[in-house]
């Protein structure tokens, strides 16, 4: 009997109720491998998520984040709010980088300016909230 199920391709499930024939996955479900006993519910990209790839009978839907948010986690499991360059996301929302730190992206945290003097160099261009300092020659 197991051999019959192994013949069921992706996009179907092995139907125990009907002599283990291969039945098509119901709408809004999929099976990505052969021989499955059930299909899996398709991921739904709602709210801050938007659909990047529609679900098919053989593969799950893939989500992106709507404008103003970016993906976090495996397979974009979460969406995090974008901030402007020169800011970082805190529990109270987007906050400007403190003096001496910068963030050149819309995500992530503010990082300290490079300390040129540690390498025996001088500051060629001062840092800003959005850009790191540029170190000059020694």
């Amino acid at each position: 009997l197991q051999d019959l199920c192994s013949n069921c391709p992706a996009g179907t499930f092995c139907d125990n109720n009907r002599s283990q024939i291969c039945s098509p996955c119901p709408p809004n479900s999929f099976s990505s491998a052969g021989g499955q006993r059930t299909c899996d519910i398709c991921r739904q990209c709602k709210g801050v998520f938007k659909t990047r790839k529609e679900c098919s009978s053989t593969s799950n839907a893939e989500c992106d984040c709507i404008s103003g948010y970016h993906c976090l986690g495996a397979e974009c499991s979460m969406c995090e709010q974008d901030c402007k360059q020169g800011q970082e996301l805190t529990k109270k929302g987007c906050k400007d980088c403190c003096f001496g730190t910068f963030n050149d992206q819309k995500r992530g945290i503010c990082r300290p300016w490079t300390n040129c003097s540690l390498d025996g160099k001088s500051v060629l261009v001062n840092g800003t909230k959005e850009r790191d300092v540029v170190c000059g020659p020694s």
Epitope: F13, P26, P27, R37, T38, C39
Partner: nanobody, 122 residues
Framework: EVQLLESGGGLVQPGGSLRLSCAAS????????VGWVRQAPGKGLEWVSA????????YYADSVKGRFTISRDNSKNTLYLQMNSLRAEDTAVYYC???????????????WGQGTLVTVSS
């Protein structure tokens, strides 16, 4: 006892129309994800249309979009499939089906009855 009884099939000429009915007993159609599956001669099963409350939408196979319409009458506990502009390739046995969501997250479907045969031929 849960039962689904399909009716309304028959012989129709290409371009013609039919309305299939599926009378349910033993459960409420309005509380379920239900639809129609067909099996053409010598072919495998194919989903045709479904009403999916889980997804909040109706589903149609690409091959029937714009020609078939699924609906249900909750007062009669009956599911319908209005089939217009029928083609020879729509010839099949049509089954009423219920989508089943399992506790472990899996999805299958079940159906009952003998189905109803639709033959499109001139």
């Amino acid at each position: 006892e849960v039962q689904l009884l399909e009716s309304g099939g028959g012989l129709v000429q290409p371009g013609g129309s039919l309305r299939l009915s599926c009378a349910a007993s033993g459960f409420m159609l309005s509380a379920e994800d239900v639809g129609w599956v067909r099996q053409a001669p010598g072919k495998g099963l194919e989903w045709v249309s479904a009403i999916l409350d889980f997804g909040g939408s109706t589903y149609y196979a690409d091959s029937v979009k714009g020609r078939f319409t699924i609906s249900r009458d909750n007062s009669k506990n009956t599911l319908y499939l209005q089939m217009n502009s029928l083609r020879a390739e729509d010839t099949a046995v049509y089954y009423c089906a219920r989508v089943v969501y399992h506790a472990g997250g899996g999805v299958t479907f079940d159906y009952w009855g003998q189905g109803t045969l639709v033959t499109v031929s001139s």
